[in-house]
Structure formats: C-alpha cells, structure tokens
C-alpha cells in the first residue's frame, strides 16, 4: 500500500539568467527510494538519480543543470523557455512510484524575486 506523500516546492518563479532549486521530498513512508527521475514539461528527462549508480545529467542539460541539493535539482542560467512544468518521479521499494509536480515561471523583470515554498500538490 502506498502511504507516502510527495511534497514539492510547488509554484515557483525566478529571474531570467538566474538559478532555481527544484525540490521534492517523499514523506510518510519507510519505502526505500531506488531512483528519482527529473522530467521537463516536454517530457524529456533532465536527470536521473539512481541509488546505486548516482547521478546522470542528460547531455542537453549538462551545462545548466547541477545535481542536488539532496535528491533535488538546480537549474541555472534560466531562460524564458524554461517556464513550465517539471516532474519528479520517485521509484520506491516496496511502495511503487510517486510523482510530484512543480511549475516554474521565469520572469524577465529584474525586480522579480525568487519565490518558493514547500507544499503538497
């Protein structure tokens, strides 16, 4: 039975050219996290964190994506095209698969402040 919940940074905004942390956290379960996939709004994978193999950043994102903190992902040198949905998929044993969603809005405005808060989607 899947008892866990995914908490995410929810809806966040950040400045063009800046960076942002995409974070998901699995709670309320003792299940072992075997793999976390990070996926972009067009369903292309950005990165995978496998418990045994470690991190793999997809070549197309190597210059702009840094692993961590933790199982999260840091997106750098943001462009307007980075606006959209991001998904974390937690593969766990024995529970199965959990999914979290984050919406990132990249703002042109130089006064835009990075806003983030943990919330349950």
């Amino acid at each position: 039975m899947m008892t866990g919940t995914i908490e995410t940074t929810g809806n966040i905004s950040a400045k063009k050219g800046g960076s942002v942390i995409l974070q998901c956290h699995l709670s309320s379960t003792m299940a072992q996290v075997t793999q976390v996939n990070w996926e972009q709004h067009d369903h292309s994978l950005l990165a995978i964190r496998n418990a045994e193999l470690g991190w793999h950043i997809y070549p197309a994102f190597k210059d702009r994506v840094a692993p961590g903190p933790g199982l999260g992902l840091t997106l750098q040198s943001l462009t307007m095209n980075d606006t959209g949905e991001y998904f974390c998929t937690y593969h766990t044993y024995p529970d199965g698969t959990y999914r979290g969603r984050i919406f990132l809005e990249v703002l042109e405005s130089s006064v835009a402040e990075h806003s983030a808060r943990f919330q349950i989607p």
Epitope: N37, E39, H43, S44, L53, F87, T89, H91, R99
Partner: antibody, heavy 119, light 107 residues
C-alpha cells in the same frame, strides 16, 4: 483493466495512405501517458513509430517524419495513425501501446493488426 | 539513433537452466533499458525497466543489470513458459529503439 485495440484495413495498395485506429478502454488518453504506434516487420524487428501525449503533443521517429501523422479523438478515447506513400516495406504487424511519461516503459499493448501493402 | 545490439540471436536451453542475454547500446544510456518477452502471435510483455527494476507481477527468476552501454538479462532457472523471444529497448531518448531479439528455444 486497461485494453488497447487496433483496427483498420488488412490490405493497402502501394502509394496509398495507411490508416489505423487504436481504441483505449480502462484509461483516458488525456491522462499522464503517451500513446504510441510500434510496428513489427515479418523478420520480427520492432520499430517505434511515434506517440501522441495526453496533452496532444506528438513525437515521431525521424525515419518516418515526412510520412507519419498521429492524431486523437478524445471524445471516443481513440488515437490514430496515418502513414502516407506506403510501399511493400511497410508491410508489418502494427501495435498501439501505452508509454508512461513518468515511468518510461510500454506497459500495455494492443494485440496487433497485420497490414499488408500489395497491389 | 541509438543502436541496440543484442546477442545471441537465438539459443537452445533446457528447463532449469540459467540463461543470460546481453544488449549493447551504441552510446551511454545510463540505466534506461527495458526488457520485453514476446510469444508467437502475441504482443510484447514488459519484464524489466530501468535496467534492473522488475515490473509488477514479474517472477523474480527474471532479472536485469548493467549501466552505460552494457546490459544483461538473466533467467535464473528457465521454466516451460519462458520459451519465447526477448527484446531489449532503450528508453533513454527518442527515437526509442529495440534490439533485434533473442529467441529462446527448447534444447
């Protein structure tokens, strides 16, 4: 129980357009999946042709890009394949299959339909 | 395109034997490889994804391993119902590509 069922003509003439439909039951085609066409040639080689996602976005195999169109009818929970200018080399068993965008594997397949291109 | 080279193309074995099939990707696919079983006249069935994750309901005699470019699929003790054709598939990037298949036959 998720089920996919292909339908279409078993025979198409060379240079014509092949049309197949996949009817999905037990899963909405507007939920978090991509809906695929895969074909298997007589020699058993499998070729992924393309998909349409729950949001209607399509991705095609570049080897077919100029000839392929995948569309959907959400009211009937169906998606369709059109392949133009067919030749004998397009003779194959055509499968529709569900791909988990977040799980990234084909978990459900149709039973397949054999399509022969011949005059 | 990523080419998946599978070997052997066929093999003869007996019930109870241990069987290993290999698949080599033409470029690094991390662990993004799935394995499918297909019986004559049927559609492929998912067994393994992400190289080593057993799909729901798949018996534990089926296992997978590997990363980067080299992957292995193993049946620890072949049962009568396992005689079929097995395919590897990379799910690293589109176009998604399959190996040519390995036909497992009764010796």
């Amino acid at each position: 129980q998720v089920q996919l069922q292909e339908s279409g003509p078993g025979l198409v003439k060379p240079s014509q357009t092949l049309s197949l439909t996949c009817t999905v039951t037990g899963s909405s085609i507007t939920s978090d999946y991509a809906w695929n066409w895969i074909r298997q040639f007589p020699g058993k080689k499998l070729e992924w042709m393309g998909y349409i996602t729950y949001s209607g976005r399509t991705t095609y195999n570049p080897s077919l890009k100029s000839r392929i169109t995948i569309s959907r009818d959400t009211s009937k929970n169906q998606f369709s394949l059109k392949l133009s200018s067919v030749t004998a080399a397009d003779t194959a068993t055509y499968y529709c299959a569900r791909w988990g965008l977040l799980r990234r594997y084909f978990d459900y397949w149709g039973q397949g339909t054999l399509l022969t291109v011949s005059s | 395109d990523i080419v998946m080279t599978q070997s052997p193309s066929s093999m003869s074995t007996s019930v109870g034997d241990r069987v290993t099939i290999t698949c080599r990707a033409s470029q690094d696919v991390f662990n993004q490889v799935a394995w499918y079983q297909q019986k004559p006249g049927k559609s492929p069935k998912l067994l393994i994804y992400s190289a080593s994750f057993r799909y729901t309901g798949v018996p534990d005699r089926f296992s997978g391993s590997g990363s980067g470019t080299d992957f292995t699929f193993t049946i620890s003790s072949v049962q009568a119902e396992d005689f079929a054709t097995y395919y590897c598939q990379q799910h690293y990037s589109t176009p998604l590509t399959f190996g040519a298949g390995t036909k497992l036959e009764l010796k």
